[in-house]
């Protein structure tokens, strides 16, 4: 069964996404699995379905259970399961393990802490941040968009960080909190203007029509963990996600490698079932950090099948 764990606190908003994908135009039906009872779509209900999202506004402990979402997609309806647990608010400061999102690590050069699940909510900046239940104050802490930046990170900055924000639904406000641990790695390093190791500038890559092709964008940025370093691919100057060709995908996440002590990143562009029109596109490998951006361009050419006849 394709399921996903979600959790929240009573009297807070909780929004859960159906773990099965679908286009925005697809209808999604939600059911409470234990009773097979349909979740209403009317927003006047405290718990209601809104397309791919299931909204608890606010959540109650009794809402805990498994919810089924059925994406009414062409060919086959796709079924997913959301395992929802709503906990009572703790009276003391400790956040139990079962309420914690994944731990993130940082160093002096890289200290971003993202607020978990925030992209599901209708919120407005600024976020409020707390460490071990204390509101963060001082110039070292900067709430930027959906993450917290800590300047000059020290080992004492390790701990549990909670983000708090307000979700707005039809003029009504609901509080949301999410907590994750932050650990500090002691690292001495430096950063450089990005150096792209692959592909070579203006490289021509031979591909075969109908086969799969991979392009790797690889760049180094300095030594140690880097703050704001990234590599990515663009198609005709457009982000892959915005280009809208599902056959062409960036590999999820960036692989970090350390070559001769240098911090390097690579991003693989996968082209499934290469088509003639792919040869007309410009493929840009971009590497960027605080020093700037470097771009190497690749074009595809058709690999001529080997002539076996003499």
């Amino acid at each position: 069964k394709f399921s996903k764990q979600s959790w929240g606190l009573e009297n807070e908003a909780l929004i859960v996404r159906c773990p099965r994908q679908g286009k925005p135009s697809y209808t999604v039906d939600w059911y409470y699995s234990q009773t097979n009872k349909s979740i209403p779509t009317q927003e006047r209900n405290r718990v209601f379905a809104s397309g791919q999202l299931l909204k608890f506004l606010p959540a109650a402990v009794a809402d805990s259970g498994i919810y089924t979402c059925i994406v009414r997609s062409p060919t086959f309806n796709r079924t997913g399961y959301a395992n929802v647990t709503i906990y009572k608010k703790q009276s003391d400061c400790n956040v139990p393990d079962y309420l914690m999102y994944s731990t993130v690590s940082g160093s002096e050069k890289n200290s971003k802490i993202y607020c978990p699940t925030i992209d599901l909510y209708n919120w407005t900046a600024p976020l409020e941040w707390f460490k071990n239940c204390q509101a963060l104050q001082g110039s070292r802490y900067r709430a930027h968009k959906s993450f917290l930046v800590i300047d000059n990170v020290m080992t004492e900055d390790a701990g549990d960080y909670t983000c708090k924000f307000i979700h707005n639904e039809n003029g009504a406000n609901y509080s949301v909190t999410a907590t994750r641990s932050f650990t500090v790695k002691d690292e001495q390093g430096f950063s450089l203007f990005p150096v792209i190791g692959a592909p070579a500038q203006n490289e021509i890559k031979e591909v075969e029509i109908g086969k799969n092709a991979n392009l790797t964008c690889s760049a180094c940025f300095g030594k140690g963990t880097q703050f704001l370093a990234a590599v990515l691919w663009q198609l005709n100057g457009t982000k892959i996600t915005d280009f809208g060709e599902p056959r062409i995908q960036q590999e999820e996440g960036q692989n970090q490698s350390f070559s001769n002590g240098l911090a390097c990143l690579d991003m693989v562009l996968r082209i499934a079932d290469v088509k003639e029109e792919d040869l007309l596109l410009q493929y840009d490998c971009l590497a960027l950090n605080l020093h700037g951006l470097r771009r190497h361009t690749v074009r595809l050419s058709r690999k001529n099948p080997i002539d076996h006849h003499s």
């Epitope: 679908g22 060919t75 599902p246 056959r247």
Partner: antibody
């Protein structure tokens, strides 16, 4: 090269079982729905089973409860376990590539050469 | 279940001349994403079927531009602008809106 190769066909008596295999190569197998489509001699095409990227399975009423489709992404393979076979199941069985990434539809764009199942 | 009906059953053609095959579905194949979930396949003698047209009118990779698909809702047409000898075989329409069902096929042969 993108290809699908079926195996496991053969002759079986009514009420018997057979397991068909399909080996995929040349594409990211785990990102695609996979289907089995059959064709009796001199007849048209009939869809008999499907499996999506997370392993959920789909069948027409004609084979439900008798046929089981499964996949092994690590081996780039899809299987069709056929039980309680009937004379009407005699056909060439094709392994077919379907929907990409849950909802990108490009038609059934890759077909195997088929494997023959005879029930008599 | 959606029923697919093709006509004609058999179509004798002359090379260089146009040809047309009709396919009708028992319910609309137009989905909310704006696509018609109707494909066309050709099965040449002794071969596996292969895809010609998907989502009503999109030519599959490597398919010559003399093949075109049109129609919406319940009525669809496959046209061959100039038939070639290599185009003989059985043509199938298939709906992919609710599971998969094929039409009975149209056999195209040279006169």
């Amino acid at each position: 090269e993108v290809q699908l190769v079926e195996s496991g066909g053969g002759w079986v008596q009514p009420g018997g079982s057979l397991r068909l295999s399909c080996a995929a190569s040349g594409f990211t197998f785990s990102s695609y729905d996979m289907y089995w489509v059959r064709q009796a001699t001199g007849k048209g095409l009939e869809w008999v089973s499907g499996i999506d990227t997370v392993g959920d399975t789909y069948y027409p009423d004609s084979v439900k409860g008798r046929f089981t489709i499964s996949r092994e992404n690590a081996k780039n393979s899809v299987y069709l376990q056929m039980n309680t076979l009937r004379a009407g199941d005699t056909a060439v069985y094709y392994c077919v590539r379907g929907i990409y990434g849950d909802f990108y539809y490009y038609g059934l764009d890759v077909w195997g050469h088929g494997t023959t199942v005879t029930v008599s | 279940d959606i029923v697919m009906t093709q006509s004609p059953l058999s179509l004798p053609v002359t090379p260089g001349e146009p040809a047309s095959i009709s396919c009708r579905s028992s319910q609309s194949l137009l989905y909310s994403d704006g696509n018609n979930y109707l494909d066309w396949y050709l099965q040449k003698p002794g071969q596996s079927p292969h895809l010609l047209i998907y989502l009503g009118s999109n030519r599959a990779s490597g398919v010559p531009d003399r093949f075109s698909g049109s129609g919406s809702g319940t009525d669809f047409t496959l046209k061959i602008s100039r038939v070639e000898a290599d185009d003989v075989g059985v043509y199938y329409c298939m709906q992919a809106l609710q599971t998969l069902t094929f039409g009975g096929g149209t056999k195209v042969e040279i006169k």
